[in-house]
Interface confidence: low
């Protein structure tokens, strides 16, 4: 039994980290393998991660870990019995990706205005909640050519757009996307969508 | 504000006992691991022992181990070391800190000592 | 035991002055590295940590790099409120070690 492809981790700076790696033939994940990753510190304990198949010959880890500082750094051990397959360290500062918001509304009762807000998914105390920036992505169910980004740039969860820079009387989706810089992280996944319909006045014609 | 005030030095004689305690304040005491350090007069810094947030692990240099005791009460917010069967080379500015905090392995608070004298 | 040698021991240095410290350990601490300021009759003060990152409220004109065996402190510019003994040490190995130490003096 050899590793193939070698474990890669990303962070949600919060509280789990998730390792994913491929082995060079089909393998029972869960029975066949362990992941034991322990914090370089004094006082710190080596915890095990019992990982789940991916595909055939891949396999994920969830590791869980209690808080997240910028100077933490892991030993990644993946073992077989006793047999070990590979060894490394993980660093979650330098490999991050956020949660994904939540909570994402559209707001259509403000005249003329559309309203989107959701929620940052750090609590207050995390680093990353005053750090995140967004991507709106609006879309219309009926026209796939109708597909838009709008980048939020400032802190606070949510973004007005004139409802009139959308066609009237269809249906758009919604979903939102966090990334921070400050840590140079991946974007994260995208939110649930959340689908509205369109409708404005149309400001009377000029002859 | 954070404080971290040590108390219980003194002047004991070789072979004798103290109990140094240290009040913390400004802080989650009960999610931070603890330490002690101490600093010989003139001399440079030596890690003393370790204390993770619930008291389940502990650490001790090799020159203190068998002798001295790290406990805490987070009832209290309060940080104990019990030294016992100590020596001349035990005489130290002794320094509560918090281990883990924030930052994995530094100290980022420190108390203003208390100075133990093992001497006859 | 990891030994952290850290040099100079003493150095004079002007005000304005770029001062540089350096901290060899005798095995790889990967950047499992802290400096701290003592002032004389004070307690010791967080400066850098993880190696080069800076502590809340610390003076960017403190500095740090390395990693692995080979430890830089710096401070760009001395001022006369840094006047003191600053220390390094690793927290990668079991014990914890630290520097002998190096004391700063303004010319």
């Known amino acids: 039994m050899k590793v193939l492809q070698e474990p890669t981790c990303v962070s949600d700076y919060m509280s789990i980290s998730t390792c994913e790696w491929k082995m060079n033939g089909p393998t029972n994940c869960s029975t066949e393998l362990r992941l034991l990753y322990q914090l370089v510190f004094l006082l710190s304990e080596a915890h095990t991660c019992i990982p789940e198949n991916n595909g055939g010959a891949g396999c994920v880890c969830h590791l869980l870990m209690d808080d997240v500082v910028s100077a933490d750094n892991y030993t990644l051990d993946l073992w077989a019995g006793q047999q070990l397959l590979w060894k490394g360290s993980f660093k979650p500062s330098e490999h991050v990706k956020p949660r994904a918001p939540g909570n994402l509304t559209v707001h259509t009762n403000v005249s003329d205005t559309l309203l989107l807000t959701w929620s940052n998914p750090y609590p207050p105390d995390n680093y990353l909640y005053n750090h995140l920036t967004y991507a709106v992505n609006i879309w219309s169910e009926n026209d796939p050519a109708d597909f838009r980004i709008y980048n939020v740039t400032y802190l606070e969860p949510s973004l007005r757009i004139a409802a009139s820079t959308l066609k009237s009387g269809i249906s758009y989706r919604a979903r939102v996307r966090a990334w921070a810089q400050c840590y140079n992280t991946t974007w994260s996944e995208w939110s649930p969508s959340t689908k509205w319909h369109n409708s404005y006045r149309e400001p009377f014609e000029q002859h | 504000e954070v404080q971290l005030v040590e108390s219980g030095g003194g002047l004991v004689q070789p072979g004798g006992s103290l109990r140094l305690s240290c009040a913390a304040s400004?802080?989650?005491?009960?999610?931070?691991?603890m330490s002690w350090v101490r600093q010989a007069p003139g001399k440079g810094l030596e890690y003393v022992s370790a204390?993770?947030?619930?008291?389940?692990?502990?650490y001790y240099a090799d020159s203190v181990k068998g002798r001295f005791t790290i406990s805490r009460d987070n009832s209290k917010n309060t940080l104990y070391l019990q030294m016992s069967s100590l020596r001349a080379e035990d005489t130290a500015v002794y320094y509560c800190?918090?281990?883990?905090?924030?930052?994995?392995?530094?100290?980022?608070?420190w108390g203003q000592g208390t100075s133990v004298t093992v001497s006859s | 035991d990891i030994q952290m040698t850290q040099s100079p021991s003493s150095l004079s240095a002007s005000v304005g002055d770029r001062v540089t410290i350096t901290c060899q350990a005798s095995?790889?601490?990967?950047?499992?590295v802290v400096w701290y300021q003592q002032k004389p009759g004070k307690s010791p003060k967080l400066l850098i940590y993880?190696?080069?990152y800076l502590y809340t409220g610390v003076p960017s004109r403190f500095s740090g790099s390395g990693s692995g065996t080979d430890f830089t402190f710096t401070i760009s510019s001395l001022q006369p409120e840094d006047i003191a003994t600053y220390y390094c040490?690793?927290?990668?190995?079991?014990?914890?070690?630290f520097g002998g130490g190096t004391k700063l003096e303004i010319k």
């Open positions: 040490h690793q927290y990668y190995g079991s014990p914890p070690t």
């Open positions: 993880s190696a080069s």
């Open positions: 204390i993770n947030s619930n008291g389940g692990k502990t």
């Open positions: 095995q790889d601490v990967s950047t499992a």
């Open positions: 800190t918090r281990q883990r905090g924030n930052y994995v392995g530094a100290m980022d608070y």
């Open positions: 400004g802080f989650t005491f009960s999610s931070s691991y």
